[in-house]
Interface confidence: low
Amino acid sequence: QIQRPSCAPGWFYHKSNCYGYFRKLRNWSDAELECQSYGNGAHLASILSLKEASTIAEYISGYQRSQPIWIGLHDPQKRQQWQWIDGAMYLYRSWSGKSMGGNKHCAEMSSNNNFLTWSSNECNKRQHFLCKYRP
C-alpha cells in the first residue's frame, strides 16, 4: 500500500500538497516570507482547480467565515498580469465581486462567498494567510 506523505504538524493534506492556514495578520509580502520560512519550498498558496478551492474552503470554514485570507496570486507589474508566486500557471480563475483594478494587486480568498471566490486587495492590508508546499 502506498503511504500518503505526511505534512508538518498543523498543516493539512490534499492531493499531493500540504496546506497551512495561519490566523495571524500579515501584509501580503510578509505572509509570503513567513510561508517561505517554514521550509519545504512553501509559498503562499496557489489554487489551481475548483476541487482544490472547495477542499481549502471547507477546511477554513471550520475555523472562521468572516476574515479574508491571502493567497499566492499577485500582480507585481500592476498591469493586471496576475501570476502565482510559486510559479504555477494562472489558468483557473475564481474572481468575484467587482473586477480588479486600482491599487489592488494582491489576491485574497473572499469570505462573502465561503472562500470559494477571490477578490483583489491592497497588498499592505494585514490579513490571515494560506501557505502550500509539496511534500
Epitope: R79, Q80, Q81, L91, W95, S96, K98, S99, G101, G102
Partner: antibody, heavy 121, light 107 residues
C-alpha cells in the same frame, strides 16, 4: 435597472479642455470600475482607462495618460472624464461603461449613450 | 500591448445565411475575451463574454468559440436586424484593446 446617463454634445475650441459626465442609476458606483472609451468618427473603439470610485485609483492606456483625468463623486453617483489640450484628433464620441464581475468575463456589460465632442475653431 | 486582428473587415450576406467572424490575438489571452455589436448611432452592446458565454438577452443564433489566440463569432440564420459593426475585445491585461471591427451588411 442599471443605467449610465452621459452629458450632452460639446463643441469646443482647439487647446481648450472639456469635462464630460456619466451619472449612474440602479447601482452604486463604488461597486464597479467605471471605464471610458473613445470612438472617432467612422472608426473603431479605444479604451481610455478606468476609475475605482471607492478610492479614486485610476488606470490608463499610456497613450491617454497626459490627455485624460478621471474623477468620481460618490455622493452624486457620477464619474467625469476631463480632456485637455484638445485637437481635432480628440473629435470623437466618448462612452462610459462598467465592467461586469469576473463571472461576466470582465466585459463591458453596460454602456452610456455616448457624448459627441467636436473640436473646431 | 496585445493586438487583435479581426477578419473580414466587411461582408455582405443574405438573410438566413450563416456568418463567421474571426479575431486573432497577438498572444494567448486565455478566453479573457468579448464580442460586441454596434448598430448605427448606438452604443456597443455586449454579445459574448468569456469567449463562449452569451450575454443576457442575446438571441441563441449568436455563438462564440475559440481559445488561446484564436476566437470566432458565429451568427446562424442571419436576420436583418443583425446588420452593424462587430468588435472583439480582450481583457487579459491593460490596456484593453479592440479589433478593428467587421462591418456586416445585408444583401
Amino acid at each position: 435597472e442599471i443605467q449610465l446617463q452621459q452629458s450632452g454634445t460639446e463643441l469646443v475650441r482647439p487647446g481648450a479642455l472639456v469635462k464630460l459626465s456619466c451619472k449612474a442609476s440602479g447601482f452604486n458606483i463604488r461597486d464597479y470600475y467605471i471605464n471610458w472609451l473613445k470612438q472617432r468618427p467612422e472608426q473603431g473603439l479605444e479604451w481610455i482607462g478606468w476609475i475605482d470610485p471607492e478610492n479614486d485609483d485610476t488606470v490608463f492606456d499610456p497613450k491617454f495618460q497626459d490627455k485624460a483625468i478621471l474623477t468620481a463623486d460618490t455622493s452624486s453617483n457620477t464619474v467625469c472624464l476631463q480632456l485637455s489640450s484638445l485637437t481635432s484628433e480628440d473629435t470623437s464620441v466618448y462612452y462610459c461603461a462598467i465592467k461586469g464581475n469576473y463571472y461576466d468575463g470582465g466585459a463591458f456589460a453596460n454602456w452610456g449613450q455616448g457624448t459627441l465632442v467636436t473640436v473646431s475653431a | 500591448d496585445i493586438q487583435l486582428t479581426q477578419s473580414p473587415a466587411s461582408l455582405s450576406v443574405s438573410v438566413g445565411e450563416t456568418v463567421t467572424i474571426t479575431c486573432r490575438a497577438s498572444e494567448n489571452i486565455y478566453s479573457n475575451f468579448a464580442w460586441y455589436q454596434q448598430t448605427q448611432g448606438k452604443s456597443p452592446q455586449l454579445l459574448v463574454h468569456g469567449a463562449t458565454s452569451l450575454a443576457d438577452g442575446v438571441p441563441s443564433r449568436f455563438s462564440g468559440s475559440g481559445s488561446g489566440t484564436q476566437y470566432f463569432l458565429r451568427i446562424d440564420s442571419l436576420q436583418s436586424e443583425d446588420l452593424g459593426i462587430y468588435y472583439c475585445q480582450h481583457f487579459w491585461n491593460t490596456p484593453y484593446t479592440f479589433g478593428g471591427g467587421t462591418k456586416l451588411e445585408i444583401k
